[in-house]
Every structure is written in C-alpha cells, then in structure tokens.
Interface confidence: medium
C-alpha cells in the first residue's frame, strides 16, 4: 500500500494548528471498517492517534490531535495537531493498513518569530571617545535558535568582541542576548540582526552613540527613536532614561507615564514611592534601577489596543519628557489552501482557490503567483476581518482557469514583522481530485 506524505518538513508556528498530511489510495469498494490507521512518534513509537474497527479511537497525545473523519474514506489520513508546542517538533509516522500495509514519516518543524531586538548600553551616560562600551542586543521568544549578526554603521561586520547566549524558557522558546564590546570613536552606529533560520525572518535594531556631555538645564529624557515592536501576548519594555546628578535620591523624583494622545495616566512614581499601575494592572516600573536613571515601563500581556504613543515625564528639579511608540504585532499562521470545486477537476475548469491565514496583526499584504513565479493579480479578492482581540483573519480568493497542471502559491506578509507565510497548491492530473488521492 502506497502511503504519501510531504517530502519537506511541515513548518508550524508555536500556538497555531498544524496539519500533517498523509494520504493513501483506497480501492473500489473500500470501507472504513477495513481501515487501521495509526499515527505515532517515529523515534519513541509513542501512540499519537488511531482509527480502528471503523471508529476514531481518539487522541493519545494530550488531546490535541484530530483526524479528518469526513475525508478518511477518500484516502485522506491527515492528522491535525492543535496548539503546537516546541516539544512537538520531530517526526510523525502514518501507518495505514487495509489488506496491505504501508507507512511514511512526516517531519514537523516548529518555529516562532523573534521580537524586534532591544538595545542597551553599559555605561549609558557621560560617554567619551575612547571609552569601552558594552552593547547588549536582546530578542525574545523565538524558535529555533537564532543567528545573530553585528555590523557598524557602514555595514562592516563586527565579529571580534561578540558573545551570544541563547536560553530556552519553559516552553522551549529562546531568549537571545548578544553582547558587543566596542571602543567608542567620535560617534558610531552599531546594529544587531537576529535571524530566524526557519522562518527566514530578520529582526534588527541599531543604536547610534554620540559621545558627549549633556547640556545643563532641563532633564534630558531619552527614549528609543524607533517604535518598540511587541508580539501580542508578550511583555514589552518601553525604555526611558534620564541622567541623575550626584546626590540624587528617589524622594526628589516625579515620574509619570501617560498615553500621549488622551493623556490617560498609565503609571507613576511620586513622593519616593511607586504609585502603581493605572492601566489595567499590566504595567510595572523597574524599582531597583530608578536610582540609576532607568525610568522604563514594563507592559505585560500586550494587546492590540495597547498600540500607540506613551509619554515618559521626568521631574527632579528640572523637567523633561519624551514619547515612545509601541507597535503591536502578531505573526500570521501558515496559510491553508482550499479548492472549490475540489474533485473531478479538468483542464479548462474554473476553480476558486482560497488562501486563509489567521490571527495576525497588523493587516497583511497578500501576493499570489504561479509555479514559475508569475504574479497572479487578475481575479483576486482579499478580505481581512478583525476579531474581538483586534487580530486579523485574512481570506484571499483567486479564480483561475485550470491548465493541464499548475501550482498556485499565496504569500501572506506581516509588514511589521517582515514575516512571510506562504502556502501552495499543485493541481495535476486529468481528471483529478483535491486533496490528491495518490
């Protein structure tokens, strides 16, 4: 019995659902009573899901798997794995037994995009040419391990004094911390690029250091020039710093964070005390760092509604303020492709191909092309609907007249994460049915 699975690994984003495709060719007169289907982990032989004696025997894998019962009779033995975790990564074997027996293994590659790196300097004040500075580039919650590249403002790679560490959290996602030690020139730009090798996603940030003393007078409040990009559900740090003078004590400090547009209070520190969060109890300061001039705000469990500008007001004897932008993002899932009609297809038939990608933010850009890279723009209709959390589901519909065979691929781009997710469907045969039976 010939059992067919994709040659390439199935790539799934953490938290999304993945379909491990597996198909066989049922003979005429085939009934489900004859079918024994077993999905198991290839290496450990642990049972994942089974179908026997005409019945779905259910999930043996944390209740996160399902078959496609309506499609089994047509030879579709695919497995749906829900809420993918890093620990799911590996090889799954699909065993099919009717009268004969066949099996094939499909690889699941798990991935998670890295956040836009945050850059910190140590020391971060009173810098002079010739000083040695440690620049730390941190990027969070990605998988698999990242590649990190440093370069200067002219694109020259900086490889000499770089130390990169990657620590996995309980979910197996990596936080990357890359440290560059440099001797300052008159001024310099240093950029760090964090690449996810599976998603081919690049996240990068730069810091420009101009070593000079701050002018006296008003408090100089420093925030990042670029928006802080945060993934929905993760925590974000809105960086804000000031330079305390010798003898400064927290009793002198008034710190207020507020929404720039509405002036709504977010968090404050006055009279030597943290006054707490006025923003849904999801904000916190860094109390141990305030005395050193770190007025940054931690925003927890970021939501789409948090996007916008936050102002950091610092008053000691003098007063200063600066605004930092928060850009919220969520990666789009790997597109699922559906055909209508999906069986008995012949050259000349008009087919509607739907490409669906879920729970991304902000709105996506969608591009279609054929198997030779030719863009398909004629009969495309794309709709994007936001759910209650403000995340978008994208549905792009392409109407095509079939040739003898053809590949149609859809690319869904997240313009903020510069993350591309793409799906393809290949229509072959004459006549044929989708999904392919063999």
């Amino acid at each position: 019995l010939e059992v067919q699975v994709p040659e390439d690994p199935v790539v799934a984003l953490v938290g999304t659902d993945a379909t491990l495709c597996c198909s066989f060719s049922p003979e005429p007169g085939f009934s489900l009573a004859q079918l024994n289907l077993i999905w198991q982990l290839t290496d450990t032989k642990q049972l994942v899901h089974s179908f026997a004696e005409g019945q779905d025997q259910g999930s043996a894998y944390a209740n996160r798997t399902a078959l496609f019962p309506d499609l089994l009779a047509q030879g579709n033995a695919s497995l749906r794995l829900q809420r993918v975790r890093v620990a799911d990564e590996g090889s799954f074997t699909c065993f099919v037994s009717i009268r004969d027996f066949g099996s094939a293994a499909v690889s699941l590659q798990v991935a998670a995009p890295y956040s836009k790196p945050s850059m910190t300097l140590e020391p971060n004040k009173d810098l002079r040419p010739g000083d040695t500075v440690t620049i730390t580039c941190s990027s969070y919650q990605g998988y698999p391990e990242a590649e990190v590249f440093w370069q200067d403002g002219q694109g020259v790679p900086l490889t000499g004094n770089v130390t990169t560490s990657q620590m996995a959290n309980e979910q197996g996602l990596f936080d990357v911390h890359s440290i560059l030690r440099v001797v300052l020139g008159a001024n310099g730009t240093y950029s760090c690029l964090v690449r996810n090798p599976v998603l081919q996603q690049d996240a990068h940030s730069s810091v420009t250091i101009t070593p000079q003393r701050s002018p006296t007078g008003a408090v100089e409040v420093q925030v990042p020039e670029d928006p802080v990009v945060a993934l929905v559900g993760t925590d974000a740090t809105l960086r804000c710093s000031f330079s305390p003078e010798p003898g400064f004590s927290l009793a002198q400090l008034n710190l207020i964070w507020q929404l720039t547009d509405t002036k709504q209070l977010v968090h404050s520190f006055t009279e030597g005390r943290d006054q707490g969060s006025a923003y849904a109890n999801r904000t916190a300061l860094f109390p141990d760092l305030l005395a050193q001039g770190n007025a940054s705000l931690r925003l927890q469990r970021v939501r789409v509604a948090d996007e916008g500008s936050f102002t950091c007001f610092v008053s000691i004897r003098d007063f200063g303020s600066a605004a930092v932008s928060l850009q919220v993002a969520a990666p789009y899932s790997k597109p699922s492709m559906t055909l209508e009609p999906n069986k008995d297809l012949r050259p000349g038939d008009t087919v509607t191909i739907t490409c669906s990608s879920y729970r991304g933010y902000p709105e996506a850009e969608v591009f279609w092309q054929d198997g030779q890279g030719v863009p398909l723009t004629g009969n495309v209709t794309t709709s994007q609907m936001a759910n209650e959390q403000g995340l978008f589901d994208v549905h792009s519909v392409l109407r095509v007249v079939l040739g003898a065979n053809g590949t149609y691929s859809c690319l869904v781009r997240n313009p903020v994460l510069q993350q591309d997710a793409h799906g393809s469907v290949t229509i072959t045969g004459q006549p044929m049915t989708f999904p392919p039976e063999a």
Epitope: F367, Q369, G371, Q372, G373, V374, P375, A404, L411, P415
Partner: antibody, heavy 121, light 106 residues
C-alpha cells in the same frame, strides 16, 4: 554551465519584422520562464514579456501587445522574440533572461549577451 | 502598474565612499531584486529577494527594505563598481524596473 546565447545583430527597415533567437543550455529549458527585456541607446531596461516554455503561456507588456510574439521550441531549447511593424524607436539591444528561484522569491539569474536591432531606412 | 522610482539618477563618487541607492515603489511589493549593468555588458544579478547577495557578489554590497522602500548600499566603493544599478519587482503585472542609477567614479 548555464547560459543563454542569442542570435546576431540585425538591421531592419521601418515597417518590417525581426525575429531574435535565444538558445538555452546547461539546465532544464522547460523549468523556467524566459523573459525579454530591451534597452534603447542610453536608456534603462524595459520589460517586454515572457514565455513559459513548458505550457507556452505568454504575457506581454501592454506597450507591446499586438506587435510582439514570443515562442519556444522545446526540442531545441530555444526561445524566440518576434517584433513586427518596426519603427525607429525600436532600435535597441534586446535581451533574453531566465527567471529563476523558488516560491516565493524569483529573479533574473542568467541573461543572454544581447542582440542589437537597428531600425533605419 | 507599479512604478519604481530610483534616486539618485546619477552619482559621482570617490573610491572608499559609502553609496546608498533607494528604490521607491508606488504600491507595496513583496520583495525587490537589484541588478548591476556595466557599459556594453548584460545586466548581472546583484541582490535577490531584497537582501540576499547573489553568488559571487562582494560583501560590500547589501540590500534592505520592505513594503514600498528599498535600499541598495555599497560600502567602501571600488573602481570596478562604476555601473548602472536597477531595481526590479514582479509582485504584480507588469514586471517593472527602476529607471536606473548611474554611478561614476571620480
């Protein structure tokens, strides 16, 4: 070695037609589209159209619709570009190029050496 | 059609200088390719898919950008880089090139 070799220079009268050939070697001719790009003296690159040698599907830039015909001969791995109703503004170097890559990223990785077409009375 | 506008049209630069050429698309594109053309030669692929160096291209060339704004950067220009540079997209029909940026070495 992957290469595209084009036919030699042509001098044509206004109103006539020209047919330029582009012979592919070193790869599977039917696996990639062949595009035609022209460049008038001192000017930039201008896309004319492409042909899929396998399906023989073609698409042309609107400017050349009705005047250009792209064909391909699988047996000889050769693509052809025929431009009719020539005028002096069609004097240019004509390039064929292979559009390569894989979903979703594609690019012209191999170019012919160019064929100079001069239209003059 | 998507119009690609390069700037500058012409630049005269000295060796070792850093050069930045920008390409702005009239609508968002999925990626950008860059080509180099020297006098009396065919164009040559330089950067593919926005930021990936083509085979054999020196590392002083780099590409970046997304959406509608893309950049080709040459760090520490060399005499052999005198050429015309073109950006190209095919996210939607027709395929278009930028008008070209000519680099002259002083």
């Amino acid at each position: 070695e992957v290469q595209l070799v084009q036919s030699g220079a042509e001098v044509k009268k206004p109103g006539s037609s020209v047919k330029v050939s582009c012979k592919a070697s070193g790869y599977s001719f039917t696996s990639y589209t062949i595009h035609w790009v022209r460049q008038a003296p001192g000017q930039g690159l201008e896309w004319m159209g492409y042909i899929n040698p396998n399906s023989r599907n073609t698409d042309y830039a609107q400017k050349f619709q009705g005047r250009v015909t792209l064909t391909a001969d699988k047996s000889t791995s050769t693509a052809y570009m025929e431009l009719s109703s020539l005028r002096s503004e069609d004097t240019a170097v004509y390039y064929c190029a292979r559009y390569s890559g894989s979903t979703p990223y594609w690019y012209f990785d191999v170019w012919g050496q160019g064929t100079t077409v001069t239209v003059s009375s | 059609e998507i119009v690609l506008t390069q700037s500058p049209d012409f630049q005269s630069v000295t060796p070792k200088e850093k050069v930045t050429i920008t390409c702005r698309a009239s609508s968002s594109v999925s990626y950008m390719n860059w080509y180099q053309q020297k006098p009396d030669q065919s164009p040559k692929l330089l950067i593919k898919a926005t930021s990936n160096l083509a085979s054999g291209v020196p590392s002083r060339f780099s590409g970046s950008g997304s959406g509608t704004d893309f950049t080709l950067t040459i760090n520490s220009l060399e005499a052999e880089d005198a050429a015309t540079y073109y950006c190209q997209q095919w996210s939607s029909n027709p395929l278009t090139f930028g008008q070209g940026t000519k680099l002259e070495i002083k």
